[in-house]
Interface confidence: medium
Protein backbone atom coordinates (compact mmCIF):
# COMPACT_ATOMS: atom_id res chain seq x y z
CA UNK A 1 0.00 0.00 0.00
CA UNK A 2 2.84 2.39 0.86
CA UNK A 3 4.44 1.66 -2.51
CA UNK A 4 1.28 2.40 -4.49
CA UNK A 5 0.69 5.50 -2.37
CA UNK A 6 4.17 6.83 -3.13
CA UNK A 7 3.67 6.10 -6.83
CA UNK A 8 0.46 8.10 -6.77
CA UNK A 9 1.71 10.88 -4.48
CA UNK A 10 5.38 11.87 -4.72
CA UNK A 11 4.82 14.19 -1.73
CA UNK A 12 4.60 11.21 0.61
CA UNK A 13 8.36 10.76 0.19
CA UNK A 14 9.12 14.19 1.66
CA UNK A 15 10.45 13.74 5.21
CA UNK A 16 9.84 15.92 8.25
CA UNK A 17 11.76 19.18 7.94
CA UNK A 18 10.79 19.52 4.29
CA UNK A 19 7.70 20.35 2.27
CA UNK A 20 6.44 19.20 -1.10
CA UNK A 21 7.04 22.18 -3.35
CA UNK A 22 4.29 22.38 -5.99
CA UNK A 23 6.12 25.24 -7.70
CA UNK A 24 9.15 22.99 -8.26
CA UNK A 25 7.55 19.82 -9.67
CA UNK A 26 6.72 18.50 -6.21
CA UNK A 27 10.38 18.34 -5.19
CA UNK A 28 11.01 18.06 -1.44
CA UNK A 29 12.34 21.47 -0.37
CA UNK A 30 13.75 22.26 3.09
CA UNK A 31 11.52 24.34 5.34
CA UNK A 32 12.48 28.03 5.11
CA UNK A 33 14.02 29.73 8.16
CA UNK A 34 11.63 30.15 11.11
CA UNK A 35 9.35 27.37 9.92
CA UNK A 36 9.06 23.63 10.49
CA UNK A 37 7.25 20.45 9.48
CA UNK A 38 6.99 17.79 12.15
CA UNK A 39 5.64 15.04 9.86
CA UNK A 40 6.45 13.78 6.38
CA UNK A 41 4.38 14.48 3.29
CA UNK A 42 3.57 18.10 4.19
CA UNK A 43 2.72 20.55 1.43
CA UNK A 44 3.62 23.55 3.60
CA UNK A 45 5.81 24.25 6.63
CA UNK A 46 4.30 25.85 9.73
CA UNK A 47 5.58 29.15 11.10
CA UNK A 48 7.62 28.73 14.29
CA UNK A 49 6.12 29.97 17.54
CA UNK A 50 7.79 33.15 18.77
CA UNK A 51 8.35 33.60 22.49
CA UNK A 52 8.07 37.33 23.13
CA UNK A 53 7.01 39.72 25.86
CA UNK A 54 6.69 37.76 29.11
CA UNK A 55 7.34 34.53 27.22
CA UNK A 56 10.87 33.17 26.89
CA UNK A 57 12.21 30.39 24.71
CA UNK A 58 12.48 27.04 26.47
CA UNK A 59 13.29 25.12 23.30
CA UNK A 60 14.39 26.63 20.01
CA UNK A 61 12.45 25.92 16.83
CA UNK A 62 14.07 23.40 14.49
CA UNK A 63 13.15 22.34 10.98
CA UNK A 64 11.23 19.39 12.45
CA UNK A 65 9.75 20.78 15.70
CA UNK A 66 8.11 23.95 16.92
CA UNK A 67 9.64 26.24 19.54
CA UNK A 68 8.43 25.84 23.13
CA UNK A 69 7.92 28.78 25.47
CA UNK A 70 7.77 29.23 29.21
CA UNK A 71 7.36 32.38 31.30
CA UNK A 72 9.94 34.89 32.48
CA UNK A 73 10.69 34.97 36.23
CA UNK A 74 7.76 36.38 38.18
CA UNK A 75 5.22 34.57 35.98
CA UNK A 76 3.95 31.02 35.62
CA UNK A 77 2.41 29.14 32.70
CA UNK A 78 -1.32 28.72 32.12
CA UNK A 79 -3.10 26.80 29.37
CA UNK A 80 -2.02 24.01 27.07
CA UNK A 81 1.56 24.42 25.90
CA UNK A 82 1.97 27.53 28.07
CA UNK A 83 -0.30 29.71 25.92
CA UNK A 84 -0.57 32.28 28.73
CA UNK A 85 1.64 33.62 31.50
CA UNK A 86 0.12 34.70 34.80
CA UNK A 87 1.85 37.05 37.20
CA UNK A 88 3.08 35.49 40.44
CA UNK A 89 2.01 36.96 43.76
CA UNK A 90 3.69 36.50 47.13
CA UNK A 91 2.59 33.77 49.50
CA UNK A 92 -0.33 35.16 51.48
CA UNK A 93 -1.74 36.93 48.41
CA UNK A 94 -3.96 36.25 45.41
CA UNK A 95 -4.24 37.86 41.98
CA UNK A 96 -7.32 40.08 41.66
CA UNK A 97 -8.54 42.74 39.25
CA UNK A 98 -6.42 45.16 41.27
CA UNK A 99 -3.25 43.08 41.10
CA UNK A 100 -1.85 41.04 43.97
CA UNK A 101 -3.87 41.50 47.17
CA UNK A 102 -3.34 40.08 50.67
CA UNK A 103 -5.56 37.20 51.69
CA UNK A 104 -8.55 38.27 53.81
CA UNK A 105 -8.55 37.26 57.46
CA UNK A 106 -9.50 33.60 57.76
CA UNK A 107 -7.97 32.65 54.43
CA UNK A 108 -4.47 31.68 53.28
CA UNK A 109 -2.39 30.93 50.22
CA UNK A 110 0.89 29.05 50.63
CA UNK A 111 1.84 29.38 46.95
CA UNK A 112 2.78 32.17 44.52
CA UNK A 113 -0.24 31.34 42.37
CA UNK A 114 -3.90 30.44 42.89
CA UNK A 115 -6.48 31.88 45.24
CA UNK A 116 -6.72 32.34 48.99
CA UNK A 117 -8.54 29.42 50.63
CA UNK A 118 -10.35 29.34 53.98
CA UNK A 119 -8.52 28.03 57.01
CA UNK A 120 -9.48 24.50 58.03
CA UNK A 121 -12.35 24.47 60.51
CA UNK A 122 -10.87 22.19 63.17
CA UNK A 123 -14.15 21.98 65.10
CA UNK A 124 -15.83 20.18 62.18
CA UNK A 125 -13.53 17.24 62.95
CA UNK A 126 -14.07 17.66 66.66
CA UNK A 127 -10.55 19.01 67.05
CA UNK A 128 -9.08 22.21 68.47
CA UNK A 129 -6.69 24.72 66.90
CA UNK A 130 -3.14 23.82 67.83
CA UNK A 131 -1.42 26.51 65.73
CA UNK A 132 -3.24 29.59 64.50
CA UNK A 133 -3.49 30.22 60.77
CA UNK A 134 -1.82 33.10 58.93
CA UNK A 135 -2.17 34.60 55.47
CA UNK A 136 0.50 32.16 54.31
CA UNK A 137 -0.35 29.06 56.34
CA UNK A 138 -3.40 27.00 57.26
CA UNK A 139 -4.25 26.36 60.91
CA UNK A 140 -2.88 23.21 62.48
CA UNK A 141 -5.55 21.14 64.16
CA UNK A 142 -4.71 19.34 67.39
CA UNK A 143 -6.46 16.95 69.76
CA UNK A 144 -10.14 17.42 70.51
CA UNK A 145 -10.97 19.86 73.34
CA UNK A 146 -12.11 16.91 75.49
CA UNK A 147 -8.60 15.46 75.26
CA UNK A 148 -7.25 18.72 76.66
CA UNK A 149 -9.41 18.74 79.81
CA UNK A 150 -7.53 19.34 83.13
CA UNK A 151 -5.35 16.40 83.99
CA UNK A 152 -5.28 15.12 80.45
CA UNK A 153 -1.99 15.17 78.61
CA UNK A 154 -1.87 17.23 75.42
CA UNK A 155 0.41 14.61 73.89
CA UNK A 156 -1.28 11.42 72.78
CA UNK A 157 0.27 8.55 74.79
CA UNK A 158 1.52 5.55 72.86
CA UNK A 159 -0.99 2.72 72.47
CA UNK A 160 -0.49 0.06 75.13
CA UNK A 161 1.28 -3.05 73.93
CA UNK A 162 -1.17 -5.89 73.42
CA UNK A 163 -0.62 -9.08 75.35
CA UNK A 164 -0.23 -12.16 73.18
CA UNK A 165 -3.44 -14.01 72.67
CA UNK A 166 -5.65 -10.96 73.27
CA UNK A 167 -7.48 -9.62 70.25
CA UNK A 168 -8.35 -5.91 70.20
CA UNK A 169 -11.83 -5.09 71.53
Amino acid sequence: FERTRSLQDPCSNCPAGTFCDNNRNQICSPCPPNSFSSAGGQRTCDICRQCKGVFRTRKECSSTSNAECDCTPGFHCLGAGCSMCEQDCKQGQELTKKGCKDCCFGTFNDQKRGICRPWTNCSLDGKSVLVNGTKERDVVCGPSPADLSPGASSVTPPAPAREPGHSPQ
Epitope: G53, F55, F75, E86, T96
Partner: nanobody, 122 residues
Protein backbone atom coordinates in the same frame (compact mmCIF):
# COMPACT_ATOMS: atom_id res chain seq x y z
CA UNK B 1 2.29 44.54 11.30
CA UNK B 2 1.44 45.50 14.87
CA UNK B 3 3.73 48.20 16.27
CA UNK B 4 3.80 49.86 19.68
CA UNK B 5 6.22 52.70 20.34
CA UNK B 6 6.59 54.12 23.85
CA UNK B 7 7.99 57.57 24.62
CA UNK B 8 8.07 60.11 27.44
CA UNK B 9 10.43 58.36 29.84
CA UNK B 10 13.33 60.10 31.52
CA UNK B 11 14.89 61.22 34.79
CA UNK B 12 12.58 62.88 37.31
CA UNK B 13 12.89 63.85 40.98
CA UNK B 14 10.78 62.17 43.67
CA UNK B 15 7.36 63.82 43.78
CA UNK B 16 7.61 64.81 40.13
CA UNK B 17 5.46 63.88 37.14
CA UNK B 18 5.88 62.26 33.74
CA UNK B 19 3.49 61.38 30.94
CA UNK B 20 4.21 58.27 28.92
CA UNK B 21 2.77 57.80 25.44
CA UNK B 22 2.39 54.69 23.32
CA UNK B 23 1.75 55.16 19.61
CA UNK B 24 -0.04 52.12 18.16
CA UNK B 25 -0.38 50.97 14.56
CA UNK B 26 -1.22 47.86 12.55
CA UNK B 27 -4.45 46.92 14.38
CA UNK B 28 -7.82 48.36 15.36
CA UNK B 29 -6.73 50.34 18.39
CA UNK B 30 -10.20 51.55 19.41
CA UNK B 31 -11.52 48.01 19.95
CA UNK B 32 -8.42 46.69 21.72
CA UNK B 33 -7.74 46.49 25.44
CA UNK B 34 -4.36 47.97 26.32
CA UNK B 35 -2.03 47.74 29.30
CA UNK B 36 1.05 49.22 30.88
CA UNK B 37 3.54 46.96 32.62
CA UNK B 38 6.92 47.73 34.15
CA UNK B 39 10.15 45.98 35.02
CA UNK B 40 12.29 47.42 37.81
CA UNK B 41 16.04 46.74 37.70
CA UNK B 42 16.69 43.12 38.67
CA UNK B 43 12.98 42.39 39.19
CA UNK B 44 10.29 40.55 37.24
CA UNK B 45 7.71 42.22 35.03
CA UNK B 46 4.78 43.74 36.93
CA UNK B 47 1.36 44.65 35.54
CA UNK B 48 0.62 48.34 36.28
CA UNK B 49 -2.63 49.37 34.63
CA UNK B 50 -5.13 48.37 31.95
CA UNK B 51 -7.85 50.07 29.97
CA UNK B 52 -10.62 48.25 28.12
CA UNK B 53 -12.05 49.44 24.80
CA UNK B 54 -15.03 50.68 26.84
CA UNK B 55 -12.69 52.97 28.81
CA UNK B 56 -12.94 50.97 32.05
CA UNK B 57 -9.63 51.12 33.92
CA UNK B 58 -7.72 49.04 36.46
CA UNK B 59 -4.61 49.82 38.49
CA UNK B 60 -2.19 47.92 40.68
CA UNK B 61 -2.69 49.04 44.29
CA UNK B 62 0.74 50.68 44.58
CA UNK B 63 -0.01 53.28 41.85
CA UNK B 64 -3.69 53.90 42.54
CA UNK B 65 -4.42 57.62 42.96
CA UNK B 66 -1.05 58.56 41.46
CA UNK B 67 -1.15 57.11 37.93
CA UNK B 68 -3.87 57.58 35.31
CA UNK B 69 -4.22 55.46 32.19
CA UNK B 70 -6.09 56.96 29.24
CA UNK B 71 -6.44 56.55 25.51
CA UNK B 72 -7.08 58.76 22.48
CA UNK B 73 -8.64 56.54 19.83
CA UNK B 74 -8.48 59.32 17.22
CA UNK B 75 -4.68 59.37 17.61
CA UNK B 76 -4.25 55.62 18.23
CA UNK B 77 -2.33 56.51 21.36
CA UNK B 78 -2.26 55.14 24.91
CA UNK B 79 -1.10 57.33 27.81
CA UNK B 80 0.09 56.88 31.37
CA UNK B 81 0.11 60.04 33.47
CA UNK B 82 2.39 59.45 36.45
CA UNK B 83 2.25 61.87 39.38
CA UNK B 84 3.87 61.87 42.84
CA UNK B 85 6.60 59.61 41.53
CA UNK B 86 8.64 57.56 44.01
CA UNK B 87 12.05 55.89 43.78
CA UNK B 88 10.30 52.50 43.64
CA UNK B 89 8.56 53.56 40.39
CA UNK B 90 11.95 53.41 38.64
CA UNK B 91 11.57 50.85 35.86
CA UNK B 92 11.31 50.23 32.14
CA UNK B 93 7.65 50.82 31.25
CA UNK B 94 6.09 48.73 28.49
CA UNK B 95 2.90 49.26 26.57
CA UNK B 96 1.07 46.10 25.48
CA UNK B 97 -1.89 45.11 23.34
CA UNK B 98 -3.74 42.91 25.77
CA UNK B 99 -5.94 39.99 24.75
CA UNK B 100 -6.75 37.99 27.90
CA UNK B 101 -8.66 40.80 29.71
CA UNK B 102 -7.48 39.14 32.93
CA UNK B 103 -5.33 41.34 35.11
CA UNK B 104 -1.78 40.01 35.38
CA UNK B 105 -2.34 37.41 32.64
CA UNK B 106 -0.67 37.69 29.23
CA UNK B 107 -1.38 35.71 26.09
CA UNK B 108 1.21 34.61 23.53
CA UNK B 109 -0.59 36.71 20.92
CA UNK B 110 -0.18 39.90 22.96
CA UNK B 111 2.10 42.51 21.45
CA UNK B 112 4.69 44.52 23.35
CA UNK B 113 6.57 47.74 22.76
CA UNK B 114 10.30 48.09 23.33
CA UNK B 115 9.83 50.05 26.56
CA UNK B 116 10.82 53.45 27.90
CA UNK B 117 12.98 53.96 30.98
CA UNK B 118 11.67 56.00 33.90
CA UNK B 119 14.23 56.90 36.58
CA UNK B 120 13.06 58.56 39.80
CA UNK B 121 16.03 59.93 41.68
CA UNK B 122 17.17 63.09 43.43
Amino acid sequence: EVQLLESGGGLVQPGGSLRLSCAASGFTFSSSAMSWARQAPGKGLEWVSSIYSSGKTYYVESVKGRFTISRDNSKNTLYLQMNSLRAEDTAVYYCAKWKTLRVGVWDESDYWGQGTLVTVSS
